[in-house]
């Protein structure tokens, strides 16, 4: 898994500081209060965030 600050998580994933790894945004349906879900909600759907995080 990528460390924070080195590269973003792949599309559809978001960094979890609690778990110290990238997590699937799809799991926010089941675990909406997880820390990484904030990153999923805020991230634009287009892949531009890979260029301008």
């Amino acid at each position: 898994e990528q460390a924070p600050g080195t590269a973003p998580c792949s599309r559809g994933r978001s960094w979890s500081a609690d778990l110290d790894k990238c997590m699937d945004c799809a799991s926010c349906r089941a675990r909406p209060h997880s820390d990484f879900c904030l990153g999923c909600a805020a991230a634009p759907p287009a892949p531009f965030r890979l260029l301008w995080p």
């Epitope: 559809g12 778990l19 349906r29 759907p45």
Partner: antibody, heavy 119, light 111 residues
């Protein structure tokens, strides 16, 4: 290293009861949804029961086939998962797997414990 | 309950070739963003092992020769190139709703 170890299987007569246990190590047990999954030649893999987290008030869900007969529980202080099974019948025979998942999938599996219901 | 139908029930693939396994759900298991379908591998005498979650996302440590695709009701697991250690039974599983259900399995043999 993640480890799930089931125990409590064996031979039981129809109508009898059995309690399965599973001890977990190598991951943050209290942050994982836990389930029991059964495997038999007749029905393949069957999800039986799930228990969620303390923050979910330990919400439980059951397959219709075991509702009212099986009870899932957990002890986070001991990293243990349980399945109390009552009024057992031949169709409950199979390998019982303890499984854990961060969400709605099964990340981790034990090696399974075999339950045989027969007279 | 959602019924998952896998096909074929068994297949034999030559070493280095592609194996394709299908899973059809009796109703959609997808939103506009995500699909709630997993794939597992079970080798003889072993418990199942998670390969892919949410239709396309490889679990950590799973080789890149495994890939998943599909949405709605039709999903596919591809293995390419197939290796000897891939001989196993593969299962799909949905997490759209309770109860979670599994497909009947596809047994992959390597020649």
């Amino acid at each position: 290293e993640v480890k799930l170890e089931e125990s409590g299987g064996g031979l039981v007569q129809p109508g009898g009861s059995m309690k399965l246990s599973c001890v977990a190590s190598g991951f943050t047990f209290n942050n994982y949804w836990m389930s029991w999954v059964r495997q038999s030649p007749e029905k393949g893999l069957e999800w039986l029961a799930e228990i969620r987290l303390k923050s979910d008030n330990y919400a439980t869900h059951y397959a219709e086939s075991v509702k009212g007969k099986f009870t899932i529980s957990r002890d986070d202080s001991k990293s243990r998962l349980y399945l109390q099974m009552n009024n057992l019948r031949a169709e409950n025979t199979g390998i019982y797997y303890c499984t854990g998942g961060f969400a709605d999938y099964f990340d981790y599996w034990g090696q399974g414990t075999t339950l045989t219901v027969s007279s | 309950d959602i019924v998952l139908t896998q096909s074929p029930a068994s297949l034999t693939v030559s070493l280095g070739q592609r194996a394709t396994i299908s899973c059809r759900a009796s109703q959609s298991v997808s939103t506009s963003s995500y699909s709630y379908m997993q794939w597992y591998q079970q080798r003889p005498g072993q418990p199942p092992k998670l390969l892919i979650k949410y239709a396309t996302n490889l679990d950590s440590g799973v080789p890149a020769r495994f890939s998943g695709s599909g949405s709605g009701t039709d999903f596919t697991l591809n293995i390419h190139p197939v290796e000897e250690e891939d001989a196993a039974t593969y299962y799909c599983q949905h997490s759209w709703e309770i109860p979670y259900t599994f497909g009947g399995g596809t047994k992959l043999e390597i020649k």
